[in-house]
């Protein structure tokens, strides 16, 4: 009897798992085995396919062969037993563009009211995403174990800190990356689940803000007791990113080492042009807070978000506010890339009552002035860029008296 | 296959001082801290400090600043721990210790052992 | 300084038993928790990092457990070969700091 080839073959590439499957043409023939071969683009002849020989069950792994993923492959399958088939040829296909990216490992970190989630490629050294490692990025599911309601976190890199979390409950994760290069997006890894500890005696510092003055950068941030002291440290922010490292050395602001109070100065010179993390500890002597929230610190929009100068032409009921460039040491105007909003804060000098005006332009009129009358006025710039959000200190204030009423020109 | 040599046992005078060594292979220690750890006979681990060799950062354990010194050398790809003013509570086998992923020292040398005797 | 207490100094076992080595932080340390295997006249060995991952070569009868300030390393099935002191260590905060030791020994 004449054996058939075997039918509906599928290739299954899942990193650098080459994975085939078949279907049997004849269930009633016993003993068959199956045989595949290859044949890569512009080649005549045909070779046997390695791992793929004299299999007598329906699916089999060619992952040892050493293949260019690059390159379009032909396969072929046939059945054997005291005869064999004819063969049956497999759509050629490039590995490559076949691949699935397989589930990522994570390696989670409990605190307190956080969770630090490190993520690795599923396969170590991979050939199929070996020019693609860096432009690896993952989504994650998270949800408390308790109530399942789901959160999506889009866009991660391989270090990533989820924040705000409950004390001694137990969340529950699953991640996946993609290749948004490649169009592909990988299969979830298991779901993995941790405890978050009992809420720890000191908190982490909050509301970590860098600002500019002069040539230095100042580093505030709140924190809830007195007598306390605060370490700063930083990390490059594209290291983040280093796919299968797990190291972060993070790094001491000198000037920002066991501080006293809740700000630290340092020269500008400590950082080169770049993006960076901070983080800011706290300690009693005895016991020692978790990390703040990690902020992203762009020394670029940070160097150029001054505070505004202006100029105030007073008049009996208004003051005309002309906004300019900032200066730098040395009076050299900052050229601002960036398009910017002005907060202007006016008060009158004898009373605490503020009032705002927010404004596009850099002529501010600010209405409704008493003659005769010390008001002052201070200024911050904003980015109007919603993913920077940086915000420049305010301008020192300047107080000018109104005109006498009857000058309204 | 990633192996910390240590160099061999010394036996030093009080007052003196010995510089040990930590000699790397298998992996670049520019990319990991080195650490150093000190256990006296019958006695638990204390850990010295660490050193981040790509930039010569280190951190030392209060108890040792001032007793020891911490450097490397990336072209040789050996970290060193230098221990002054010796005295019989330094007399101990120091280890050397690769700080690895998730800052956990994951592959340790043979250990020296500093012998303090008059 | 971040002090870890293992409260037995010592352990009598048996092959086969189990046993559950503990290990208390003043403070604290989140999952920051390593142990070590010593035996005698060696080098410590990593076991356990992050206080519940093993590394790869570590037989799975070891696993760790434990956030906060309490943690243990559970040895199931307990065999001849795993006797030997176990530390645990904290790196949450410099100084990094170990705890005392627990010595397995045979009944």
């Known amino acids: 009897k004449n054996l058939k080839s075997p039918q509906k073959v599928e290739v299954d590439i899942i990193d650098d798992n080459f994975i085939l499957r078949w279907n049997r043409s004849d269930e009633s023939v016993g003993n068959v085995t199956f045989s595949f071969d290859y044949q890569k683009t512009g080649m005549d002849n045909w070779i046997k396919l390695s791992g793929c020989q004299n299999i007598t069950s329906t699916k089999c792994n060619f992952s040892s062969l050493k293949l260019n993923v690059y390159e379009e492959i032909k396969l072929r399958i046939r059945a054997e037993k005291e005869n064999t088939s004819s063969w049956y040829e497999v759509d050629s296909f490039t590995p490559f563009r076949k691949a699935q990216i397989g589930p990522p490992e994570v390696h989670l970190e409990a605190e307190d009211k956080a969770i630090v989630i490190h993520i690795s490629p599923g396969t170590k050294d991979s050939v199929m995403w070996a020019l693609d490692g860096l432009s690896f990025t993952y989504s994650l599911v998270i949800w408390k174990n308790s109530s399942g309601v789901e959160e999506r976190i889009e866009n991660i890199y391989s270090r990533h800190k989820i924040y705000k979390l409950s004390p001694e409950t137990t969340y529950c994760l699953k991640v996946k990356a993609a290749l948004l290069t490649s169009w592909k997006i990988g299969v979830y890894s298991p779901v993995h689940c941790i405890k978050t500890t009992v809420e720890n005696e000191l908190p982490p510092p909050e509301n970590i803000e860098v600002s500019v003055q002069n040539q230095n950068y100042v580093l505030k941030w709140d924190y809830t007791y007195a007598n306390m002291t605060f370490q700063v440290q930083w990390l490059h922010a594209f290291l983040k990113r280093n796919p299968g490292n797990h190291l972060y050395k993070w790094k001491q602001i000198p000037d920002c080492e066991n501080v006293k109070t809740t700000q630290c100065v340092f020269p500008q010179n400590v950082f080169q042009k770049g993006i960076y993390l901070l983080r800011v500890q706290a300690s009693d002597g005895n016991n020692t807070s978790f990390w703040s929230e990690e902020i992203k610190f762009d020394t670029e929009i940070q160097a150029f978000l001054l505070p505004p100068v202006f100029n105030i032409r007073s008049l009996s009921d208004s003051f005309h506010i002309y906004i300019g460039a900032p200066k730098q040491s040395g009076n050299t105007p900052v050229i601002q890339d960036y398009p910017l909003i002005y907060e202007i804060i006016f008060w009158e000098n004898t009373s605490n009552a503020e009032r705002k005006i927010i404004e596009k332009k850099t002529d501010v009129t600010v209405p409704n002035l008493k003659p005769l009358t010390v008001y002052c006025v201070k200024a911050r710039a904003h980015t109007m860029d919603e993913k920077l959000n940086k915000s420049s200190v305010f301008s020192d204030a300047v107080c000018e008296k109104t005109k006498p009423g009857n000058t309204s020109k | 296959e990633v192996q910390l040599q240590q160099s061999g046992a010394e036996l030093v005078k009080p007052g003196a001082s010995v510089k040990l060594s930590c000699t790397a292979s298998g992996f670049n220690i520019k990319d990991y801290y080195m650490h150093w750890v000190k256990q006296r006979t019958e006695q638990g681990l204390e850990w010295i400090g660490r050193i981040d060799p790509d930039d010569g950062e280190t951190k030392y354990a209060p108890k040792f600043q001032g007793k020891a010194t911490m450097t490397a050398d990336t072209s040789s790809n050996t970290a060193y721990l230098q221990l002054g003013s010796l005295t019989s509570e330094d007399a101990a086998v120091y280890y050397c210790?690769?700080?690895?992923?998730?800052?956990?020292?994951?592959?340790w040398g043979q250990g020296t052992s500093v012998t303090v005797s008059s | 300084d971040i002090v870890m207490t293992q409260s037995q100094k010592f352990m009598s076992t048996s092959v086969g038993d189990r046993v559950s080595v503990t290990c208390k932080a003043s403070q604290n340390v989140g999952t920051n928790v390593a142990w070590y295997q010593q035996k005698s006249g060696q080098s410590p060995k990593a076991l356990i990092y992050t206080a519940s991952y093993r590394y790869s070569g570590v037989p799975d009868r070891f696993t760790g457990s434990g956030s906060g300030t309490d943690f243990t390393l559970t040895i199931s099935n307990l065999q001849s070969e795993d006797l030997a002191d176990y530390l645990c260590q904290q790196y949450f905060s410099y100084p990094h700091t170990f705890g005392g030791g627990t010595k397995l020994e045979i009944k």
């Open positions: 210790a690769r700080g690895g992923n998730y800052y956990v020292m994951d592959n």
